[in-house]
């Protein structure tokens, strides 16, 4: 039975040209995290594998930095980066947990972080 929950940074906004940390946290389970995939729709951004470390997609290799932790730092933001991001936790023995973050990249200097929220 899957008992865990994913906590994410929720809806967030950031300035064009700036950077943002995409962060998820898996709680309420003793399952072992074997891999975390970061995706935008069906496109891979990066993978953090427990044994092999980080792999950054070619499309993002020049502006994605691994971490902090299992999170991802997205740099040199453009308005095209606006959209949904998913953290996909591969765990044993539970299976897969998915968290969602919505990022809005703003032209102006007004960019506020949304509240944290949980996805069961």
């Amino acid at each position: 039975m899957m008992t865990g929950t994913i906590e994410t940074t929720g809806n967030i906004s950031a300035e064009k040209g700036g950077s943002i940390i995409l962060q998820c946290h898996l709680s309420s389970t003793t399952a072992q995290v074997t891999q975390v995939n970061w995706e935008q729709q069906d496109q891979l951004l990066a993978i953090c594998n427990a044994d092999l470390g980080w792999h950054i997609s070619p499309s993002f290799k020049d502006r994605v930095a691994p971490g902090p932790g299992l999170g991802l730092t997205l740099q040199s933001l453009t308005v095209n980066d606006t959209g949904e991001y998913f953290c996909i936790y591969h765990t044993y023995p539970d299976g897969t947990y998915t968290g969602r973050i919505f990022l809005e990249v703003l032209e102006s200097s007004v960019a506020e972080h949304g509240a944290r929220f949980q996805i069961p």
């Epitope: 074997t34 891999q35 891979l44 092999l52 470390g53 070619p58 591969h90």
Partner: antibody, heavy 120, light 107 residues
């Protein structure tokens, strides 16, 4: 030594499905992506997509989404590509290749190729 | 998608010649370019990665260079076993794309 041994050529009817295999030997299967590449006669290769065998994470060239499906069997160190709803456009040589996990963006060993002929 | 163009589809040269094969990208690819050799029997081998890094086991007569959108593969002293088709491939972003190939023949 590193080897990627592909299944033999296939002759299939339009509308059918085919599954091509790629058996890896001489290295740690889970430490490398398996890449799939299509080559029609007289044309340059086309990248279909990739699978990370350890987790089964698969990513596709948008052009081949819905056409190709990747799987991998860690116990036999074998990757598979299924092609569905075959048409004459799918007649080609299909290659598997490996790409090291991490920030290594080249295909350093290739299979010998599998020739697929789709004909009524 | 980024288009890779190899304008010379076939090339004839003599043994011992210095041969240069060119490849251009539809936009800048920041040296994110690989070269592969495909023998007449279909066997594919990686020659060069990241524009100019020689893959292990590849003879030193092969070299690569370029920047921006224009790249080249040079064979300094053509040998009989170099008869093959050569493909460039970028990895600036997904999807990876390949050039149409340059077939090298002996005069």
């Amino acid at each position: 030594q590193v080897q990627l041994e592909q299944s033999g050529g296939e002759v299939m009817k339009p509308g059918a499905s085919v599954k091509i295999s790629c058996k890896a030997t001489g290295y740690t299967f889970s430490n490398y992506w398996i890449e799939w590449v299509k080559q029609r006669p007289g044309h340059g290769p086309e990248w279909i997509g990739e699978i990370l065998p350890g987790s089964g994470s698969a990513y596709y060239n948008e052009k081949f989404r819905g056409k190709a499906t990747f799987t991998a069997d860690k116990s036999s160190n074998t990757a598979y590509m299924q092609l569905s709803s075959l048409t004459s456009e799918d007649s080609a040589v299909y290659y598997c290749a490996r790409q090291k996990y991490g920030n290594y963006y080249y295909f350093d060993y290739w299979g010998q190729g599998t020739t697929l002929t789709v004909s009524s | 998608d980024i288009q890779m163009t190899q304008t010379t589809s076939s090339l004839s040269a003599s043994l011992g010649d210095r041969v240069t094969i060119s490849c251009s990208a539809s936009q800048g690819i920041s040296n994110y370019l690989n070269w592969y050799q495909q023998k007449p029997d279909g066997t594919v081998t990686l020659l060069i990665y990241y524009t100019s890094s020689l893959h292990s086991g590849v003879p030193s007569r092969f070299s690569g260079s370029g920047s921006g959108t224009d790249y080249s593969l040079t064979i300094s002293n053509l040998e009989p076993e170099d008869i093959a088709t050569y493909y460039c491939q970028h990895y600036s972003k997904l999807p990876y794309t390949f050039g149409g190939g340059t077939k090298l023949e002996i005069k």
